[in-house]
Structures are given as structure tokens and as C-alpha cells.
């Protein structure tokens, strides 16, 4: 059928809670493409009716909630004018056991559910929440061994739990909980995270960590104004340059004449052993030439991009 097959890593998922997977494969999905989801090589596409428990939401497949019988291989087919890609995603549903103290970690979990804290340092855990715009997420609560986390060493910052002066007692089973609202209905998301510790010096020195972007695409309408933050953590004594580039050129230089796209003023928040930096990029007016172009956030030797993409056509308007 002329489609290129791409096989994604297996995903281990928790039963009885929402789950979503976005069919993006830059730069394939950055142009004008159609995305259709299927289950187990079925010829019938996944429903697009938002009341359906499993439905396609733009480029996402959304489970509200995930159930035992949903395990299987799902395919999303990305069709462009001259191309076709079929992405295979193997989803395995398991019964969550976050409060079962006899389970010493869950070895088959995805990497984002296994995180490492550095002893004696200030560090953080991330609650990975990947859902389409139609899902509204409430505030995040954090738990360790099924008890809500309190104390001055712990600070919740957006999707992260900041842990100051990490100790050996901080290892173990964590969970982040959030209430997701979709079409007026509420669902609980509870992500278990197995947290191990190390004395090793993380990145072996001052290699900054880009929290966002994550080499992801952003849907944005033509002609609109867009501001995107680049969030970076780095050591206090770092001398790293942080900037936005396009075509390997500073955006302020690249758009020197029009000044249509500009880099913002860098700000930072100081924590005990690291700084959290934010530097934004502003698109005063998004133009066609911006789509599919990687806008790179650089921080020392680290880099990550965003790519603008046109929203999928809204057929309800016709």
C-alpha cells in the first residue's frame, strides 16, 4: 500500500485511567497531512466522536479511560501529498500497584516512569502528562509510598517536584496525581514513578537540561501571535549561553530587518544548587514560511526544537 512502517517503543500503561498518544513524527507531521488511527490492523478507523471512550482527537488517540481489553498494536497513518507513513505503537495495559510495598519497582515501565535523584543535590522529578488540548489538567499532587508529600524540602513547580538536598530516604515509589476534565467529565490520572538515587554527578559537570521544548511540534493558526518559552535548568556557576536560533543563526539576526520573530529577555529562578532559566521566542505574526522549520533553543551544548504546524482542518465548520 506504499506506506513506510515505523515501529515505536512499547508503552506500558495503567488500567482505569486516561491515556493519550500523539501521532507526531517531525518533520513528516509538520506539513499538510491527514492522520488516521486504527487498532490491530483494522480497516475501520478509530472513532472521532468525542463521546466515545476511545476516539481520535486531532492527531491524538485518546482513551477515557484505558481498560484491560485495550492492549494491542495501534497504527496511525500519516498521509501527505507525496508520502505515507504508518506508525505502530504497542500498548500494554497492566493493573497499577503503586501502593503494593512488596513490589520493588516495576521493571517494565517506560523510561519516563523511572527517574533518578542525585544524592546531596537539589534535583527534581517530572510528572509526564501528554494529553491533547481538549483535556484540562488540574493541579498536581505528589505522593511517596502512598502518602501525600509535604515538607519544606519539596516544592511543586508546574509538572515537576523539586527536591532539595536529596537523601537516600528519597528513593522508592512515587506517584503524581491530577484530575483531568474532558467534555465535562472528570478522570483521575495517577502516574507511578520508581525513583532511584545516585551519588554520580549527573551530567558530569555543567551540561544544561532543557525541560521544554522537547523536539515537539505546536499547532498554530496562520497570522496569529505566538510566544514559546524555553525552560532550562543549569548549575549556578554555569557560563552557558542560552538563545533561540533558526537555520543556525540567532533569531534576532535572522529576522533583523522585519523584527517579526524576536528572542525575549532571559529570566531565572534560583534554587539551592541550580538555576531555572526561561528565554522566550515571540512570533508577532506566524507566516507560512515558519511551518516545518525547526526553531532551536540552545543552552551550552544542549539543544531542542519546536516546529510550527498548521492545525488539522476542522470539518465541523463545514
Amino acid at each position: 500500500d506504499g506506506c513506510n512502517d515505523i515501529f515505536m517503543k512499547n508503552e506500558m500503561l495503567s488500567a482505569s485511567q486516561p491515556f493519550a498518544f500523539n501521532c507526531t513524527f517531525p518533520p513528516i507531521t509538520s506539513g499538510e497531512v491527514s492522520v488516521t488511527w486504527y487498532k490491530n490492523s483494522s480497516k475501520i478507523p478509530v472513532s472521532k466522536i468525542i463521546q466515545s471512550r476511545i476516539h481520535q482527537d486531532e492527531t491524538w488517540i485518546l482513551f477515557l479511560p484505558m481498560e484491560w481489553g485495550d492492549s494491542g498494536v495501534y497504527q496511525c497513518v500519516i498521509k501527505g501529498r507525496d508520502s505515507c507513513h504508518r506508525i505502530h505503537v504497542n500498548l500494554t495495559v497492566f493493573e497499577k500497584q503503586w501502593c503494593d510495598t512488596s513490589v520493588k519497582g516495576l521493571p517494565n515501565l517506560s523510561d519516563e516512569y523511572k527517574q533518578i535523584l542525585h544524592l546531596g543535590k537539589d534535583d527534581s522529578l517530572t510528572c509526564h502528562l501528554h494529553f491533547p488540548k481538549s483535556c484540562i489538567l488540574g493541579p498536581i499532587k505528589w505522593y511517596k509510598d502512598c502518602n501525600e508529600i509535604t515538607g519544606e524540602r519539596f516544592t511543586v513547580l508546574e509538572t515537576r517536584l523539586l527536591v532539595s538536598n536529596v537523601s537516600a530516604e528519597d528513593r522508592g515509589n512515587y506517584a503524581c496525581q491530577v484530575i483531568l476534565t474532558h467534555s465535562g467529565k472528570q478522570y483521575e490520572v495517577l502516574n507511578g514513578i520508581t525513583v532511584s538515587i545516585t551519588e554520580r554527578a549527573g551530567y558530569g559537570g555543567s551540561v544544561p537540561k532543557i525541560i521544554y521544548p522537547k523536539n515537539n511540534s505546536i499547532e498554530v493558526q496562520l497570522g496569529t501571535t505566538l510566544i514559546v518559552d524555553c525552560n532550562i535548568t543549569d548549575t549556578k556557576d554555569n557560563t552557558n549561553l542560552r538563545c533561540w536560533r533558526v537555520n543556525n543563526t540567532l533569531v534576532d539576526d535572522y529576522y533583523n530587518e522585519s523584527k517579526r520573530i524576536r528572542e525575549g529577555v532571559e529570566t531565572h529562578a534560583s534554587f539551592r544548587e541550580y538555576n531555572l532559566y526561561t528565554v522566550n521566542i515571540t512570533f508577532l505574526e506566524v507566516k507560512m514560511e515558519d511551518y516545518g522549520l525547526p526553531f532551536m533553543c540552545h543552552a551550552g551544548v544542549s539543544a531542542a526544537y519546536i516546529m510550527l504546524q498548521l492545525p488539522a482542518p476542522d470539518f465541523r465548520a463545514y
Epitope: K104, D111, T198, Y203
Partner: antibody, heavy 120, light 106 residues
């Protein structure tokens, strides 16, 4: 159950490059730290270096100019290359990883070791 | 570099003896790790985070210490305990092992 298996030639000529591969089952090398350690005959253990979940590498400064650790996530393998070898590099080479009781530095899982002899 | 010095380098003891192996670091370390190795075999994690016994390690073993001085103690030596024991630190790179203590039957 995490298992590690070293493979590579048992005999390397002086000045050549020693190449070993560690194949991992039961865990993903995109989590944790993946270490190389060697044991000289009749001597103690020497830490060579590691490759981390993110692909970051650390090398013992005494070997840094000659050592390279890399990985192939599609095969769930990580490798050791040691260049310009001499007889002093004759040793049993082990790959190992931690994570026991959520402690990455507790090297609980080891390969069986492979003896590499440097000789012409 | 943190130098790890184990004493004694070798030790002859009898079954039932109480044995103490010491590991001294040239600078402070946060935690100590101990490994047991028998001839022709890979090392085994024995004690981690200074005082925690790895799975399968008999309770006659114990670990203690802080700063620059750490000990591994066997309360009543058994035949299967005769082996070489190594200490290791991960506090400061390069991550160093002690030279080993060979425990032999008297």
C-alpha cells in the same frame, strides 16, 4: 531478571584496540547507568567508566585518552573500546549495572566477565 | 583522587572467628559499597549505602562507618565467607575501589 553478557576477542595484539560488547536483557539501557570494570590478574578491581541513561559517558581519568564507551539502544547493548593496548591492559573485563533497592550505584548485576590477553 | 586503603590486605582466620575489615578513604565519602569476589567469579554486591545487606547476604555480616573510616564485620566466620572483599566509593570521581582484603582459612 536483569542479565548482562560480555563478548569480544580474548586476544588482542599490543598497540591495537580492544573491543568488547555487553548485551543486556531484562532491562533497558535507556534507564540507569551501565558500567565497565576490570580485574587485573592477581590484582584488584579498577573502575573504567560508564554510559548513562541519557547517553552521557564518564571515563576514569587514568584511561580517558584511550577509552570510548558507546551504546546501541536498538540492540540494548553497550560497548567498550580501549585503544593502544599494552600488556598492562590484560585483565578480566566486566560489565555491570546497579539499581538494586533503587540505588543506581549498588552494582548488583554483573556479566560473567571475559578475559582479554594483550600479547603478540 | 580519593584513595581507598583496605586493611589488612590479607587475613587468616578460623571458622567461628569475628572478623573486621577496614576501608579508609583519603577524603570524606558519603556512602561505602562492599563486594565479595571468589576466584574465577564476578564480584557480588555485598553491602550498599554503608550498612544495607544485599539480597541473600547472611545477617552475620554488617557494615558501618562514616566520613573516611568504614568497616565490614563478620560476627562468626563460616566456610563460605572465605573470599576477597572490596570496598568502593561513588562520592567523588574517579570512582575507586580498595585494593581488596583476601580472607583465608587458617
Amino acid at each position: 531478571q536483569v542479565q548482562l553478557q560480555e563478548s569480544g576477542p580474548g586476544l588482542v595484539k599490543p598497540s591495537q584496540t580492544l573491543s568488547l560488547t555487553c548485551t543486556v536483557s531484562g532491562a533497558s539501557i535507556t534507564s540507569g547507568y551501565w558500567n565497565w570494570i576490570r580485574n587485573h590478574p592477581g590484582k584488584g578491581l579498577e573502575y573504567i567508566g560508564y554510559i548513562s541513561y541519557s547517553g552521557y559517558t564518564y571515563y576514569n581519568p587514568s584511561l580517558k585518552s584511550r577509552v570510548t564507551i558507546s551504546r546501541d539502544t536498538s540492540k540494548n547493548q553497550f560497548s567498550l573500546k580501549l585503544s593502544s593496548v599494552t600488556a598492562a591492559d590484560t585483565a578480566v573485563y566486566y560489565c555491570a549495572t546497579g539499581g538494586y533497592d533503587y540505588v543506581e550505584d549498588a552494582l548488583y548485576y554483573w556479566g560473567q566477565g571475559t578475559l582479554v590477553t594483550v600479547s603478540s | 583522587d580519593i584513595q581507598m586503603t583496605q586493611s589488612p590486605s590479607s587475613l587468616s582466620a578460623s571458622v567461628g572467628d569475628r572478623v573486621t575489615i577496614t576501608c579508609r578513604a583519603s577524603s570524606n565519602v558519603r556512602y561505602m559499597y562492599w563486594y565479595q569476589q571468589k576466584p574465577g567469579k564476578a564480584p557480588k554486591l555485598w553491602i550498599y549505602l554503608t550498612s544495607n545487606l544485599a539480597s541473600g547476604v547472611p545477617s552475620r555480616f554488617s557494615g558501618s562507618g562514616s566520613g573516611t573510616s568504614y568497616t565490614l564485620t563478620i560476627s562468626s566466620l563460616q566456610p563460605e565467607d572465605f573470599a576477597t572483599y572490596y570496598c568502593q566509593q561513588f562520592t567523588t570521581s574517579p570512582y575507586t575501589f580498595g585494593q581488596g582484603t583476601k580472607l583465608e582459612i587458617k
